[in-house]
C-alpha cells in the first residue's frame, strides 16, 4: 500500500514537473519572441534629408541624401536617394546669359520638392559647390564669377529649402571630400569589425582607398601615403575621423580635366600646323570638325600655347592612331622638372602610390563606355582595346553607337587615351599596380564623388572621435538573446531526452 502511494506521488510529481517545465519553456520562448519582435518593430523613423548641387565645368548635378536622424554620427548611414542631372552646360557658361540660370535649375529643384516630404522642406539644407569650371572663370574675372554665383544664390533662395549658400570649392577640398565619400561608403572609417561584407571592393582591413577623380576641367588624386612626412605642405591634409588620425596627400590639377586637356592638346598641336587643317590622331578616321580659334584661346588653360594664327578657324581631321595620340597627350605633362624627391608632372610633388584606389567620375564614365572597368582587364589589354577603338572609322563608330550624342562619342578615343596617359605617365601607375585601380560609379547606390563628403562635413556628421556605443546594436542584442534562448531550450529538451532514456525516465510511472 505504502509502495503504491509513493508510486502515485512520484508519478504525480514527475508529470507536474514535466508539465511545468514544458509550459515554462513555451512561455519563455513566446516571451523572448515577443520582446524581440516588439523591440525591433519598425518605429516611425525620423528621417533627415540634404541636397548638394555639384556645379561642374560641363554640367550641374543635384544629389539628394537621406539618413536616420538618431544615427547621424554613425558611419555609413547616409545614402543617396536621387540624382538629377540639370539640362544644359556648366554654370560658368551662363556668364553671358545669367537671366537663364533660374530656368536652368528649375527642373531638378522641383524634383527635389517632390522627393523630399513637404514637412521636411524647411529643415533640408541645400549646398551648391562649384568646381574647376568656375575656378577658371574666376581666374579670368572675379566679377563674372561673382555675378554667376549671385544669380545662382538668388534662384536657389526661392525654394522652400534651407539654402546654405553657393561657393567655389578649392581643388584641395574637392580631392579631400571625394576621398571622404568613397571611404565613408566603403565603411573604412568604421571601427567595428564586420562578420560579412556587402560592400564591393571591401577588403577586411581598415586601410583607406585612395581617390582618383576626373572632371571636365580638373583632376584630383588623394591618398594616405606610407611616409607620414611630406615634402610639400601645400599637398598635405590632416584629418581626425571617428577617433583615428589620417595624414592625407592631395593635389588638384587644374586644366587637366578631360575637356580642358583636349583644348590644351589642340592649342599645342595647332602651333605647328602648316595650314588650317589639323590631322589629329585622337579622333577616328573620317571624323571632321571645325574649331574657332577664339574658342580655343577662351580658356586660361591654353594660355601657354597662345599665338597669333593666320586663320580664324581650323578643321580637325581624324586619323585615329592611339600611339600617336598617346605621344601627343604626353607632351601636356612636363616631367623634365621636379624640385622634390618625386613628382607627378609640372613640378608637383607626388609621394609613392600606396594601396588601392577608387577611380570615379569621368574615369568611370569613359572607361565604362569603353567596357574597360572590369577588375580582370589588365593594363596591356586596356591599351590593346584603345588601339582598336581609336582606329575604327568614324562612320562605323556612329552606326555602332547610334544612341550616343556625336559630341561625346567623338571624344572617347581622346578621353580613353588621356586617362591611360594620366594614370600611367602622370601618376606613375604601372602594369602591376593597375590592378589596384577600381573604376567605381556607385557604392551601395550612392555616386562616388565629392558631394557626399562635402555634405557630411558641413552638417558635422563625421565626428572627430569615435561615438560612444555598446559593442552590439540594440537590435542585434535582442536578436542574439532570442536566438540563444531558443538554442538553450532546444538543448535542454534534447539533453533530457538523451540523458534520461525513455525506459528509465518512465519506469517509476509504471
Amino acid at each position: 500500500m505504502e509502495d503504491t502511494k509513493e508510486s502515485n506521488v512520484k508519478t504525480f510529481c514527475s508529470k507536474n514537473i514535466l508539465a511545468i517545465l514544458g509550459f515554462s519553456s513555451i512561455i519563455a520562448v513566446i516571451a523572448l519572441l515577443a520582446v524581440g519582435l516588439t523591440q525591433n518593430k519598425a518605429l516611425p523613423e525620423n528621417i533627415k534629408y540634404g541636397i548638394v548641387l555639384d556645379a561642374g565645368s560641363s554640367h550641374t548635378s543635384l544629389y539628394i541624401y537621406k539618413w536616420p536622424a538618431e544615427k547621424e554620427n554613425d558611419t555609413g548611414v547616409v545614402h543617396q536617394v536621387e540624382e538629377c542631372r540639370v539640362k544644359g552646360p556648366g554654370i560658368s557658361k551662363y556668364v553671358q546669359k545669367v537671366n537663364e540660370i533660374g530656368i536652368y535649375l528649375t527642373d531638378c529643384m522641383e524634383r527635389a520638392r517632390e522627393v523630399i516630404p513637404r514637412s521636411q522642406h524647411q529643415e533640408t539644407p541645400v549646398y551648391l559647390g562649384a568646381t574647376a569650371g568656375m575656378r577658371l572663370l574666376r581666374m579670368e574675372s572675379e566679377e563674372l564669377a561673382d555675378r554667376v554665383l549671385d544669380v545662382v544664390e538668388r534662384s536657389l533662395s526661392n525654394y522652400p529649402f534651407d539654402f546654405q549658400g553657393a561657393r567655389i570649392i578649392t581643388g584641395q577640398e574637392e580631392g579631400a571630400y571625394g576621398w571622404i565619400t568613397i571611404n565613408y561608403l566603403l565603411g573604412k572609417f568604421s571601427q567595428k569589425t564586420r562578420w560579412f561584407s556587402i560592400v564591393p571592393y571591401e577588403t577586411n582591413n581598415q586601410e583607406t582607398f585612395g581617390a582618383l577623380d576626373l572632371g571636365g576641367a580638373s583632376t584630383q588624386i588623394t591618398f594616405v601615403p606610407q611616409n607620414q612626412t611630406t615634402e610639400s605642405p601645400d599637398n598635405a591634409l590632416q584629418f581626425r575621423l571617428y577617433g583615428k588620425d589620417y595624414n592625407v596627400y592631395t593635389h588638384s590639377f587644374l586644366c587637366y580635366g578631360k575637356d580642358q586637356a583636349l583644348w590644351q592638346k589642340l592649342a599645342k598641336d595647332i602651333q605647328v600646323a602648316s595650314n588650317e587643317i589639323l590631322r589629329d590622331p585622337c579622333f577616328h578616321p573620317g571624323y571632321k570638325k571645325v574649331v574657332n580659334v577664339s574658342d580655343l584661346y577662351k580658356t586660361p588653360c591654353t594660355k601657354r600655347f597662345e599665338m597669333t594664327l593666320p586663320f580664324q578657324q581650323f578643321e580637325i581631321q581624324g586619323i585615329g592612331n592611339y600611339q600617336q595620340c598617346h605621344q601627343s597627350v604626353l607632351e601636356l605633362f612636363n616631367t623634365s622638372y621636379c624640385p622634390y624627391s618625386q613628382c607627378a608632372f609640372n613640378g608637383i610633388f607626388l609621394p609613392p602610390l600606396q594601396g588601392d584606389f577608387g577611380a570615379f567620375s569621368a574615369f568611370y564614365f569613359v572607361m565604362n563606355f569603353l567596357n574597360l572597368t572590369s577588375e580582370k582587364v589588365s593594363q596591356e589589354k586596356v591599351t590593346e582595346m584603345m588601339k582598336k577603338f581609336c582606329s575604327q572609322p568614324w562612320e562605323e563608330i556612329k552606326t555602332s553607337y547610334a544612341g550616343v550624342k556625336e559630341k561625346y562619342l567623338s571624344e572617347y578615343c581622346f578621353s580613353g587615351t588621356y586617362i591611360l596617359s594620366l594614370l600611367l605617365q602622370g601618376y606613375h601607375f604601372t602594369a602591376d599596380s593597375w590592378e589596384h585601380i577600381h573604376f567605381i560609379g556607385k557604392i551601395q547606390g550612392s555616386d562616388a564623388g565629392w558631394t557626399l563628403g562635402y555634405m557630411l562635413n558641413l552638417t558635422n556628421m563625421i565626428p572627430a572621435e569615435q561615438p560612444l556605443s555598446t559593442p552590439l546594436s540594440h537590435s542585434t542584442y535582442v536578436f542574439l538573446m532570442v536566438l540563444f534562448s531558443l538554442v538553450l531550450v532546444i538543448v535542454a529538451i534534447i539533453g533530457l531526452l538523451i540523458f534520461h532514456k525513455p525506459s528509465y525516465f518512465w519506469k517509476d510511472m509504471v
Partner: antibody, heavy 116, light 111 residues
Framework: QVQLVQSGAEVKKPGASVKVSCKAS????????MHWVRQAPGQRLEWIGY????????TFNQKFKGRATITVDTSARTAYMELSSLRSEDTAVYYC?????????WGQGTLVTVSS | DIVMTQSPDSLAVSLGERATINCKAS??????????MYWFQQKPGQPPKLLIY???NQGSGVPDRFSGSGSGTDFTLTISSLQAEDVAVYYC?????????FGGGTKVEIK
C-alpha cells in the same frame, strides 16, 4: 590670410636688367593670375602685364612687350618680373597684385632706381 | 587703349563733408552686365588699396562711407563723411580689356 611679399629695393645702371620677386601665401597660388604694375614718381599707375601661374602663359601691355618677362616658380609660390634694357624713366616702384580682373591684394612694392 | 580721365585732380573737403570724385572712360567698360571699374586709395609709401570693385561693390574691410556708382563710361566715387584718415590719392581703373589702365589720380585733402 593672403600675403604678397616682394624683394628689396634695387639700384641699376642704364642698359642693365632687374628681376623683382613676389612670394605669395595664404591661397592656392595657381588659382589666380599675378599682375605687375609700376608707379613712377608723381605718375599714374601703369599696368605691365600678368602671368597665369597655372601654366606660365603671360600677357603684356604692348609698351613693355619684348622688354618685360614674367615667370613663376610654382613650388616656391613666387612670381618674377624682369625688365631689361633699363632707362632712367624706368625708375619706379614695381608692385605685384593678385587677381583676374580685381586687384584685391598687392605686394608692398619694390623701388627700382635706374641711375648712371 | 581705354583712357581713364579723373576729375578733379585735387579736392579739399572739410571733415565730415561729402567728397565726390569722377572718372570717365573713353569707351564703355561694361561687359556681360558687369562694370569692370575699380577704385583704389593710396597713401604715401603704401601700395594701392581696393575700395570699390564692379563699380559699386565695397572691398572687404572698407568703411561704409565709401560708395561707388555709375555704368558704361561715367563713374563716381563718393566719401559721404570725410575723415582725417581718408587723406590720400584715389585712382580709378578699368579691366575690361588689355592693357588695363588707371586714371591720373585725385588728391583728397582736408580743408
Amino acid at each position: 590670410q593672403v600675403q604678397l611679399v616682394q624683394s628689396g629695393a634695387e639700384v641699376k645702371k642704364p642698359g642693365a636688367s632687374v628681376k623683382v620677386s613676389c612670394k605669395a601665401s595664404g591661397y592656392t597660388f595657381t588659382d589666380y593670375n599675378m599682375h605687375w604694375v609700376r608707379q613712377a614718381p608723381g605718375q599714374r599707375l601703369e599696368w605691365i602685364g600678368y602671368i597665369v601661374p597655372l601654366n606660365g602663359g603671360s600677357t603684356f601691355n604692348q609698351k613693355f612687350k619684348g622688354r618685360a618677362t614674367i615667370t613663376v616658380d610654382t613650388s616656391a609660390r613666387t612670381a618674377y618680373m624682369e625688365l631689361s634694357s633699363l632707362r632712367s624713366e624706368d625708375t619706379a616702384v614695381y608692385y605685384c597684385a593678385r587677381g583676374g580682373t580685381r586687384f584685391a591684394y598687392w605686394g608692398q612694392g619694390t623701388l627700382v632706381t635706374v641711375s648712371s | 587703349d581705354i583712357v581713364m580721365t579723373q576729375s578733379p585732380d585735387s579736392l579739399a573737403v572739410s571733415l565730415g563733408e561729402r567728397a565726390t570724385i569722377n572718372c570717365k572712360a573713353s569707351e564703355s567698360v561694361d561687359n556681360f552686365g558687369v562694370s569692370f571699374m575699380y577704385w583704389f586709395q593710396q597713401k604715401p609709401g603704401q601700395p594701392p588699396k581696393l575700395l570699390i570693385y564692379g563699380a559699386s561693390n565695397q572691398g572687404s574691410g572698407v568703411p561704409d562711407r565709401f560708395s561707388g556708382s555709375g555704368s558704361g563710361t561715367d563713374f563716381t566715387l563718393t566719401i559721404s563723411s570725410l575723415q582725417a584718415e581718408d587723406v590720400a590719392v584715389y585712382y580709378c581703373q578699368q579691366t575690361k580689356e588689355v592693357p588695363y589702365t588707371f586714371g591720373g589720380g585725385t588728391k583728397v585733402e582736408i580743408k
